[in-house]
Each structure stands twice: as C-alpha cells, then as structure tokens.
C-alpha cells in the first residue's frame, strides 16, 4: 500500500543543472532504506505521456542524468521519480517545470592568465556545453546566450582594482608594476537571464624588468 505521505520515501526531487548538464536528484525520506529502488520518467511540457528513462529504472543511486532527454533549449520539461521500498510501498514525486535556459547555473570560465613585464593578459576559452548543433558541433555558452559577456577584475592592492569587460575573449591589463603579484578574477555574466558564474581566479606575477640590470 502507498504510504500516507510520499515524503516518507522520497524528498527534494529536483533538477540540478550546470552549463546545461541536467541531472535529476532526490533524497530518500525518513522511511527510505538502502534497498529502496527508484525509477525515473520524464516528459516534455504539453505532452501527455511519460517516457521511462533507460538506465534509470529500479536503481539505488539518487541521481539520473537527463541531459540528452532535456536538451532542447526551447522546451520545458518535467521529471518524476517513483520510489519502491523493499516492503513494496511506493511513492511518486514530480519536479517543478524545468527550463534549462532559465535554471542552468554557470561554472567558472576556463581562462589562461599570461604574465608580462608591465601587463597581464587573460584569454577566456569558450565554454562547451553538452548540447549539439545540427552540424554535430557542441554549442558553447556564447552560441546560446547572445548577451553573455565576461567581467574581469585585477586586484592591484587592498584598495584598488582594475576592471575590464566585454564579449571578446582576449583582454590585457596594462600599466602594472614589474615583478609584482596580482589576483585576477573572471566571471561570466548573462544579464538577460540574471546569471553570473562563480569566478575563475588566477594569482599571477608580472615578470621582472630585465632592461635595468
């Protein structure tokens, strides 16, 4: 028989999405046991039928990768988890409506920081996603978000920072003191979707000025 409250077996069914990798996660409830098994279904918003996710049927782990199944950027999705205990009790819980564009969070960018004598160059590498274009290429975040830009900061000392920003991939902070350590932080910003990545940080030291030796 079904428990009085599904939360006894199953809790916190939700999508966790980062850079468009969409993972369904959940927790067992207070009456869940290690031998409770979970089966996952998903559907596109507006569709009637649920589709069983292959590889996520009667599993004991508490996550299921639905990246491929929820990979259309223009669609909205639901997923649901059915938990069945060793004693035959079952409970089903559904996610809130999921939009990868809206809900995905952004990881820090991949950046190369290059020291020079009086400047520090920062090269941002475009971030790939699991989403494939019609030609088979993986889309980058830049392909998906028109408004994506990079915000770069260089901590010169405790009271002074230099800022750069834009949609370019190459930046350079000029007018720095040779043989000095600086802390750089680089973030991805997407204002339209109110997204901001955690910062990539690089601690770099300008090169010594050999011209005076």
């Amino acid at each position: 028989h079904a428990p009085e409250d599904p939360s006894d077996l199953l809790q916190h069914v939700k999508f966790q999405s980062s850079n468009f990798e969409n993972i369904l996660t959940w927790d067992s409830g207070p009456e869940g046991t290690p031998d409770t098994v979970y089966s996952i279904e998903y559907k596109t918003y507006g569709e009637r039928d649920w589709v069983a996710k292959k590889g996520c049927q009667r599993i004991t782990r508490k996550s299921c990768n639905l990246t491929v199944e929820t990979g259309n950027l223009t669609e909205l999705y639901y997923a649901r988890v059915t938990a069945v205990s060793a004693g035959g009790r079952s409970a089903t819980k559904m996610t809130d409506r999921f939009s990868s564009l809206q809900h995905t969070t952004l990881k820090p960018p991949d950046v190369t920081c290059i020291s020079k004598v009086r400047s520090i160059q920062m090269i941002v590498h475009p971030t790939p996603t699991p989403i494939r274009a019609g030609d088979g290429h993986r889309l980058t975040l830049e392909d998906i978000f028109h408004d994506l830009f990079y915000h770069l900061e260089l901590q010169v000392n405790r009271t002074y920072q230099m800022h750069l920003g834009g949609k370019q991939r190459e930046y350079e902070f000029f007018g720095l003191t040779p043989d000095t350590e600086f802390l750089g932080t680089i973030m991805i910003c997407v204002p339209t979707w109110a997204k901001e990545s955690a910062p990539y940080m690089c601690r770099v030291k300008t090169l010594p000025d050999r011209t005076w030796t």
Partner: antibody, heavy 117, light 107 residues
Amino acid sequence: EVQLVESGGGLVQPGGSLRLSCAASGFTFSSSWMYWVRQAPGKGLEFVSVINTRSGITHYVESVKGRFTISTDNAKNTLFLQMNSLKSEDTAVYYCATRIQGLIDYWGQGTQVTVSS
Amino acid sequence: DIQMTQSPSSLSASLGDRVTITCQASQSISSQLAWYQQKPGQAPKLLIYGASRLQTGVPSRFSGSGSGTSFTLTISGVEAEDLATYYCLQDYSWPLTFGQGTKVELK
C-alpha cells in the same frame, strides 16, 4: 577580408512581403551572431533581429515579432530576413552586420526597403 | 528595453575644437557601450568599444569614458573628416539599442 553584401530590397505595398539576403565571406559564418539593423529615412539606427548561425537561436525587436523571420543557409554563407505584413514604418535601409571577436564591427552597404501604396 | 539618451542632438564645431557627446542609459549597462560614426550613405563605423577602448585603426583623438549609466565620447581636436553623426550603442542586453545620434557640423 570580411564582406557582407545585402540584396532583395525594393518597393512593396503595405501588407506585402519581401525577402532580404546577405551574402557573407571572409570569416567563419557557421559559428557567428548575425544581425539585421535598419535605418528609417533621416532617422537613427535600430536593431531588428539577430541569429546565432550555429545554435539557431534568434531574437527580434518587439515591433517586428510575428512578422519578420531571420534565418541562414550555412552551406551558402547567407543570412536572410523574411518580412511579411509590411507597414509603412518598415521603410528603411536594412543593413546586415556580424559580431567578430566580440565586436559588431562589420556591416554591409545596406539595401533600401520602401513600403508604399 | 534599455533606453539610450544621447545629447546634444547636434553641435557646431570649428576645426581643432574639443567636442564632447554624452550618452545616458536607463539602467546600468556595466561597460557594455560602443560608439559608432556614420557618414551620409555609409554604414556605421565602430570607434570605441567597452566604453573606453579604441578600435584598431581609429585615430587617438577619439576617446571614451564612463561606466554604469553615464558615458562620454570626446574628440580632442576635430578634423574635417570627423564631421558625421555619432551614435552610442548599448551592447548589454537584447534588444541592443542606439542613442538618437549627434550630428557634428562645421561652425
């Protein structure tokens, strides 16, 4: 050398349709953001639409939504703007432009669209 | 949509004058602002991007400053070839929007 060449403009009656083309060369067309920008006679500049040629993601300015459709033929390095239900206020020079290395720095020479009865 | 308010709408300058054009955004756009120059019958030409960075090949008499909501384009000594219309553009969020333009004429 980056080149953008627009074509397809002309005189059309209100309610009519027109399809603009922009032939692109000198850069990687299949992974770029491409724009249509217009300029009404004696007026300022207005971004009309944008498309990412790899993802197919599109955006439109509110005044043309439901009437204009931006698209590409990546095999032919060509950008299109299908304009339906044209109004007199759509009369303008239409430029295509592209973003290269983060900057909207390359523009075509423009094609004139006149909507008049 | 973000509104860009540019002023003045026109100005008369003598050759060698210092000219300042301002642009105000209706909300913060960080440093996502560009300045373009347009001459009659031509497409716009990029002068400044990132609010203050000079595009390659643009004379150093052009400079830009500002961040957030308030921006300025300065021509330190106007030359005959600078007589044109100047537009600011916010490149922060779609729809990208231009200012109304400033026509720089000869006094």
